[in-house]
Interface confidence: low
């Protein structure tokens, strides 16, 4: 505890200027006071002033009024500070002395003489109210007041409760009359050291270091820290927990950046061709007649369909073509012959059959040859029979389609989904990617195919120290600690700036 016993000397009367021994002061009693404050004694005895003592300078001669002074010599009220719990009782001895010596420090002068003394014993509660008294003896009268008040920062009935108002990171409060704390606006907690965050700031996902603030923990964003941050690089997806990337419709892949509906999103096929989706970023354009190219962007020559028969050569003309027929043929496409079987028109072992009474003929071609004169070797790939980007290959008398990944069928017309065989266990969600399927696992499972059962929540045991945030499913250990500033280590257990002798260094 800590307080001050204050004694206010008001008036001293010694009209005859007499000492206690009956002698008179010459030229007058130059009066100073000695005060002794001690614990309560039923009978006041000599001995140490256990609660303190103080002396005044010379305050006047014989009779005088004592003026209040707050500083300097002759301070009044007189201050008797104590550094213990005020017991509520006391004994007080006030002595008036005459000094022939120094005004300011009469204590040190030889030849001081007692004028009078009074003794007060009793109880006194802490408070601002002055208790006023007056003591008389045959020669003198002393008017005075006294009280006990607590020192700055001490409170309570016995000045035993210490409370220092403060406004720093250890607390933000003022002191109540009883010494209890009264938090400044915006602060709460036992020591008023916890800021009251922005109203609505998410209790778990947000925090603050000063009032009306909302700072987001890792993985969260927004004014109130109630919006999760998706996985870094997530293009066309959302999250319901941090670092998730749940793809929007039509998108796939870990980062939802693989277009599952390229035809709709990009319309790559030109000139009225038909677009077919074929996996992430995959598509095929089926061209209308007269167009070619990956996107059907190239217009074909009028001769591209080889309209001239019997070896006729084709010449492009504006909006049309013209066939130059070889000897023995005529017609728009050189389809009419002037030859007969007698001219041996059939090549490659073709058999000649006369028609129209021998005025024309027809060749019957052996396998792998075609044309009106069996002059062309059959190419079974010319009709582009393979769909979805399949490669056509001639294999002797037949041809085969070599399909791109994800397609099957004789003409690669069937789309195979990697997810069709349900590779994801325990209800995992499957995503078709170019390099194979990827599974998004439900809570409690992990692994490439969701085949590993997580037997417990790795964060439940609170493995992270020093206020670090715990996340699961991001590492082989099944948890990751996100350290606050100033800490490192797999569990954030080591403060930054360790002494060199410390056995672990990040």
């Amino acid at each position: 505890g800590s307080g001050i016993f204050q004694l206010r000397l008001q008036e001293f009367v010694n009209q005859r200027g007499m000492l206690a021994n009956g002698q008179s002061c010459e030229p007058g009693c130059r009066t100073f006071f000695r005060i002794c404050l001690k614990h309560f004694q039923a009978t006041f005895s000599e001995g140490p002033c256990t609660f303190g003592n103080v002396s005044t300078p010379v305050l006047g001669t014989n009779s005088f009024v004592v003026r209040d002074k707050n500083s300097g010599s002759g301070r009044n009220p007189l201050q008797l500070p104590f550094n213990f719990t005020w017991p509520g009782t006391f004994s007080l001895n006030i002595q008036a002395w005459h000094t022939p010596g120094d005004d300011l420090r009469p204590e040190t002068s030889p030849g001081n003489s007692l004028i009078s003394q009074i003794i007060i014993q009793g109880s006194l509660a802490v408070g601002k109210i002055w208790r006023t008294d007056e003591q008389n003896d045959t020669l003198t009268r002393l008017s005075y007041s006294y009280r006990v008040i607590c020192s700055d920062n001490y409170y309570g009935e016995s000045c035993s409760r210490l409370c220092k108002k403060r406004d720093d990171h250890f607390g933000h409060y003022e002191c109540q009359p009883d010494g209890s704390l009264s938090c400044l606006p915006g602060w709460t907690g036992k020591y008023c050291d916890q800021p009251i965050c922005l109203s609505g700031c998410h209790e778990q996902n947000g925090y603050c270091s000063k009032p009306d603030e909302c700072i987001c923990r890792p993985g969260w964003q927004g004014r109130l820290c109630n919006e999760c941050i998706p996985h870094n690089g997530c293009r066309h997806g959302t999250c319901s927990i941090p670092w998730q990337c749940a793809c929007d419709e039509g998108w796939g892949g870990l980062f939802c950046d693989q277009d599952l509906n390229y035809c709709t999103h990009h319309s790559p096929c030109k000139n009225g061709s038909t677009c077919s989706n074929s996996g992430p970023k995959g598509y095929t354009c089926t061209c209308l007649p007269g167009y070619t190219g990956e996107h059907c962007e190239l217009g074909l020559s009028k001769c591209a369909s080889n309209p001239c028969r019997n070896g006729g050569s084709c010449k492009d003309q504006e909006n049309s073509y013209h066939c130059l027929c070889p000897p023995g043929y005529y017609g728009q496409h050189c389809e009419h012959s002037t030859l007969t079987c007698a001219d041996s028109p059939c090549f490659n072992g073709g058999s000649c059959r006369e028609r129209n009474q021998g005025s024309s003929y027809a060749c019957e071609c052996p396998p792998n040859f075609t044309g009106s004169n069996c002059e062309k070797k059959v190419d079974r790939c010319t009709s582009n029979p393979c769909a979805n980007g399949g490669q056509c290959q001639n294999r002797g008398p037949s041809r085969t389609c070599r399909c791109r990944p994800g397609f099957t069928g004789t003409h690669c017309e069937l789309h195979i989904s990697d997810c069709a065989r349900s590779p994801c266990a325990h209800g995992g969600t499957c995503h078709d990617l170019e390099n194979g399927p990827v599974c998004t696992c439900p809570a409690g499972f992990s692994g490439r195919r969701c085949e590993v059962r997580i037997t417990h929540d790795a964060c439940a045991s609170g493995p992270c120290f020093n206020g670090a945030t715990c996340y699961t499913g991001l590492s082989p250990n099944n948890f990751v600690c996100n350290c606050p500033y100033g800490f490192v280590g797999s569990r954030c257990e080591f403060p930054v700036g360790l002494p060199p002798s410390f056995p672990w260094v990040a």
Epitope: E11, G60, F64, V65, D68, K69, S143
Partner: antibody, heavy 121, light 104 residues
């Protein structure tokens, strides 16, 4: 309830001495609880403390006026007085007497109604 | 000589709080009194010893003193509080008044 009343001439010539008396009624001037003071206020301006006295006669003066001021007490008449010498027009003011309470930290808890003193030839 | 400085004027709406400051070097170590003076009247003590109210002074008057500044606060100001206000302290043996503040 204690009352204070100033009295004295309302007009003083320059270089002369201004003299005022304050009469205390409803209470004794013989008390160690009080000082008896003089304060003045030039027209339209603020208050200026002149000085005070205890009933024992101890006096305290404003340093800026000390050379010209004398305050005295007459306990038999329950009065105290102010004398201000060598006055000039700058001394024209309303002069108040007041009781300064020791228990109030020297606060003036009772004032006279004031008297206007004009310094003019 | 010791000086006490006050703002010349303070305006306040009825019912609002008026704060009048009084500044002086080390003022927190001295007892400060505050006086109210209405036109044509004598000053009236409203605060003594920094924050104490004499009997008869309304509770809406309060005072504080720390550092180099003492403050008189009138909460819930009423029309009757319109007046000049002076702070006063004791420097050594002499009384010193502030320059005064007109509260309207």
């Amino acid at each position: 309830e204690v009352q204070l009343q100033e009295s004295g001439p309302g007009l003083v010539k320059p270089s002369e001495t201004l003299s005022l008396t304050c009469t205390v009624s409803g209470g004794s001037i013989n008390s160690g609880n009080y000082y008896w003071g003089w304060i003045r206020q030039p027209p339209g301006k603020g208050l200026e403390w002149i000085g005070d006295i205890s009933y024992t006669g101890s006096t305290y003066y404003n340093p800026s006026l000390k050379s010209r001021v004398t305050i005295s007490v007459d306990t038999s008449k329950n009065q105290f007085s102010l004398k201000l010498s060598s006055v000039t027009a700058a001394d024209t003011a309303v002069y108040y007497c007041a009781r300064e309470d020791v228990m109030y930290g020297g606060g003036g808890d009772s004032w006279g109604q004031g008297t206007l003193v004009t310094v003019s030839s | 000589s010791y000086e006490l400085t006050q703002p010349p004027s303070v305006s306040v709406s009825p019912g609002q709080t008026a704060s009048i400051t009084c500044s002086g070097e080390g003022l927190g170590d001295k007892y400060v009194s505050w006086y109210q003076q209405k036109p044509g009247q004598s000053p009236v003590l409203v605060i003594y010893e920094d924050s104490e109210r004499p009997s008869g002074i309304p509770e809406r008057f309060s005072g504080s003193n720390s550092g180099d500044t003492a403050t008189l606060t009138i909460s819930g100001t009423q029309a009757m509080d319109e007046a000049d206000y002076y702070c006063q302290a004791w420097d050594s043996e002499a009384g010193v008044f502030g320059s005064g503040t007109k509260v309207t």
